[in-house]
Interface confidence: low
Amino acid sequence: ANSLLEETKQGNLERECIEELCNKEEAREVFENDPETDYFYPKYLVCLRSFQTGLFTAARQSTNAYPDLRSCVNAIPDQCSPLPCNEDGYMSCKDGKASFTCTCKPGWQGEKCEFDINECKDPSNINGGCSQICDNTPGSYHCSCKNGFVMLSNKKDCKDVDECSLKPSICGTAVCKNIPGDFECECPEGYRYNLKSKSCEDIDECSENMCAQLCVNYPGGYTCYCDGKKGFKLAQDQKSCEVVSVCLPLNLDTKYELLYLAEQFAGVVLYLKFRLPEISRFSAEFDFRTYDSEGVILYAESIDHSAWLLIALRGGKIEVQLKNEHTSKITTGGDVINNGLWNMVSVEELEHSISIKIAKEAVMDINKPGPLFKPENGLLETKVYFAGFPRKVESELIKPINPRLDGCIRSWNLMKQGASGIKEIIQEKQNKHCLVTVEKGSYYPGSGIAQFHIDYNNVSSAEGWHVNVTLNIRPSTGTGVMLALVSGNNTVPFAVSLVDSTSEKSQDILLSVENTVIYRIQALSLCSDQQSHLEFRVNRNNLELSTPLKIETISHEDLQRQLAVLDKAMKAKVATYLGGLPDVPFSATPVNAFYNGCMEVNINGVQLDLDEAISKHNDIRAHSCPSVWKKTKNS
C-alpha cells in the first residue's frame, strides 16, 4: 500500500510539476503535507531556473549534477541526495519526510555523524578508564602518563616516581617533598627557596610594595599599617588603605550667633574691655545652654585687678563669687540649669545688691556695701573674660573651681552695650561657633585624644590592680581606638577599639594587648541612633566583658601570657587615653585611628569628666554631643 502511494505521488509530481509548471499550492496537493512541500518547493524553483528554455546551456556548464529537468525534480524528494551525512562517520542514510536519518559508525555521533565520540569524556567510562591522560583520536582513543610517572602494563594506569628518595640532596637545606609526578623544595611561610644556593631566604615583602602606606617586614612575614590619625584604616585585603567612613552622620551645623565656651581646653574664649561713664554699673544678660555641671561662664574685674566678679556653674547651679575692697562673697542658688535647654541669665548690679535672674525670675540677691568696681578719673573700666579667667586669679578665688565649661551663650548684652563688636569677632572664627543642636554626652570628633592619670592599683585587692571600664558609646565611624593604656616605653599594654566588621553595617570590638588582639566581639550594630553599653573587667588573672548581647568571661590558651604582659606594664606607670592614641609607633596596636562619636567612660566606678583631663584636644566636647543627622527629603 505504501509503495502504491509513493507511485501515485510520483505520477502526480510528473504530471503537475514536470510536464507542466506548478505553484506552491499545486505542489502541496502532490505532497499533502507542509514539511515536504516547504522542503521541495525552493529546490524545485532552483531546478526551474537551471533548466528553463534559454538557460539550458548555462546550467550544463554549472555544477548541476542532473542532465534534465525531470531528473533534477525527481531527485528533490530524496533527502539523502546529495548525502547530508559525514562520510567518515556515517554507516547509512535513510530518507525521511523532508528530512533524513544518518546511522553512524561506532565512535561517531551527531545527526549527520559529524562528531567523533570523545571516549575520554564518556560519563559511563570516566577519562576512558585512563588513570591520567586520555588522548582522543577520530573514532578511538589511547592512555598516556604525565611527567614523573610511568605507564603500567595494563596500558591504562600510571605509577609515581619518588624523586626525593632517588636524589636525597636535591633540595639542599630545604625540605624535599615528593608530590605526585614531581617534587618540591619547601620553605616555611614568608621564606622563598633559592635555586642557586639551595636554601631558604626571607622574603622582604616590603620591598615588593605589598602595602599601600606603611609596611613592617620581619623574618617570615610582614604587616601593613595605615595612618589612622589621618583617617585611614586597613582594608579587608590587609594591604590597601581606605578612608574610615562615616556610619552615622551627625548634625554639625553651627551658628555664629551662638558663642562656644569650650573652644580652648585651657584659656579664655573671649576677652572684652569696657570704658564707660562712672555712673555705670556692672550688668550681663545672656541665654545659656549646657549639660556641663561646673565651669566659668564669665569673669569680670576692675582694671587694677582690685575687685572681681565670677559667674560660674557648680553642681549645675549658678554660683557667684565676688571680691572688692568692701566684701568677699560666694553664693550659689536657683534651679539646676545644666539641662541642655536655653536658659536666660541676667546678672545686674543694683545700688545695694547684685541681682541674679534666671528666666527673668530672681534666684539670688547678694548684698554689697558699695559699688562692685570703683570708678577712676570719671570712668568705670572693666575687663570681661568669657569661659575662663587669667591664670593668676586661680589662687585668689574664694572657692576653687574647674573653669572649663562646655556650653554656649547667645543674645548677650554686657554692660548694657548690646552685642556690638562681639558678633563681628566671632563671625570670622568657625571654632567659636556653637552647634545648633546638642545632646547629653561627650563627643570625640576623630581628630584628637584626652589624657587622664588614673591609679589602677588597688592595695586592698588580692589582684593588685584592676581595670573596670564601662563605656556608653554612639559611634559615628566604625573604626577607632576608644580607650588605651600607654606605657612609658611607648607600648600599648591594653586597648579597646572599634573596627568595621566584615559583615555589612556592623562593627567588631577588639580588646588588645600591645599589637595582639586578645578578644574580638563580632558583628554588633553599634552605628545606630541609640547608645550601646559595654563593660570590661580586667585584672592580672581574668578578663570579663559584657555587651548588649552577652556577658562572658574570656579564657583561651594565649590569654594568660597576654595578661602577664599587661600585669608587667600595670606594675609600672600607664597613662590613660580616650579617643585614640598618642604618638606611638603604627605597629603598637591593631588599630590606630581616632574614635569618632559620642562616648561616656566610667573607670573603676568613677565617671570620667573630660574637664578634669590632664590634656584634651580642643575639638573634643566634654559635655555635649551633636544630634544624629536626619536626611531631609523632597518628594
Epitope: 535647654l341 543642636t437 545632646e439 547629653k440 545606630s528 541612633d529 541609640q530 544630634s627 544624629v628 536626619k630 536626611k631 527629603k633 523632597n634 518628594s635
Partner: antibody, heavy 119, light 106 residues
Framework: QVQLVQSGAEVKKPGASVKVSCKAS????????INWVRQAPGQGLEWMGR????????HYAQKFQGRVTLTRDKSTSTAYMELSSLRSEDTAVYYC????????????WGQGTTVTVSS | EIVLTQSPATLSLSPGERATLSCRAS?????MYWYQQKPGQAPRPLIY???NLASGIPARFSGSGSGTDFTLTISSLEPEDFAVYYC?????????FGGGTKVEIK
Amino acid sequence: QVQLVQSGAEVKKPGASVKVSCKASGYTFTSYWINWVRQAPGQGLEWMGRIDPYDSETHYAQKFQGRVTLTRDKSTSTAYMELSSLRSEDTAVYYCARWGGSGYAMDYWGQGTTVTVSS
Amino acid sequence: EIVLTQSPATLSLSPGERATLSCRASSSVSYMYWYQQKPGQAPRPLIYATSNLASGIPARFSGSGSGTDFTLTISSLEPEDFAVYYCQQWSSIPPTFGGGTKVEIK
C-alpha cells in the same frame, strides 16, 4: 489639611493575614515617616514599626519581626501594614501616625482600623 | 528596650485643680513625648521634646524633666482634660509608651 485615612474594619481567622492601608493627603508623603501603633481593647499603645516613604527604609519592633511587613506606594501616597499568622492576641485597633524624625511627636494619626481575630 | 513607668495609674481630681503626671524611664532618654487619648479616639500629641507644646494645645499644659524622670503638668484642669495620658520615648528602637495615666473627675 493633613489627613491620614485608614481602611475599614477587618475580621480574620487565626493563621490568616491582614493588610491595612493608610492614605496620606495634605502634605508631601515622602517627607515624613509613617509609624504603626496598635492598641488592644482596654490596653495601652504598642509600637509596631515605621517606614520612610522616601526610600522604604523600615524598622520593626522585635516582637513583630518576621510577621509584620511595612510597604508604601508613592504614586498613591499610601502606606500599608501587613500582619501575618494572626492570633487572637492581635485583636486591636491599628493606627498609622505621621512622624517627622528626632525631636518630633507623632503629630497626625489615622482614625484607626479595628482588626478582630476570631475562629 | 526602654521601659516607661507612669504614675499614678489613676488620678482623681476636680476641675480647676492642678494635675501632675509622672513618667519614669528605665534608662536615660533624650526627650519625652506626651499624648492625650479620649475613648474611641486616636491619641493626640500634647508635648514634644519634653517641654514644647504641640500645635493647638493650651498653655495650661506643660512638660519638664530630664534623664529618667519626666513630668506632665496641667495647671488648672478643664472638663475636656479628663482623659488617658501616655508618655513615649524615641531614644531607642523600639520606641515605647508608658502604661498610661487616667485623669478622672473626682
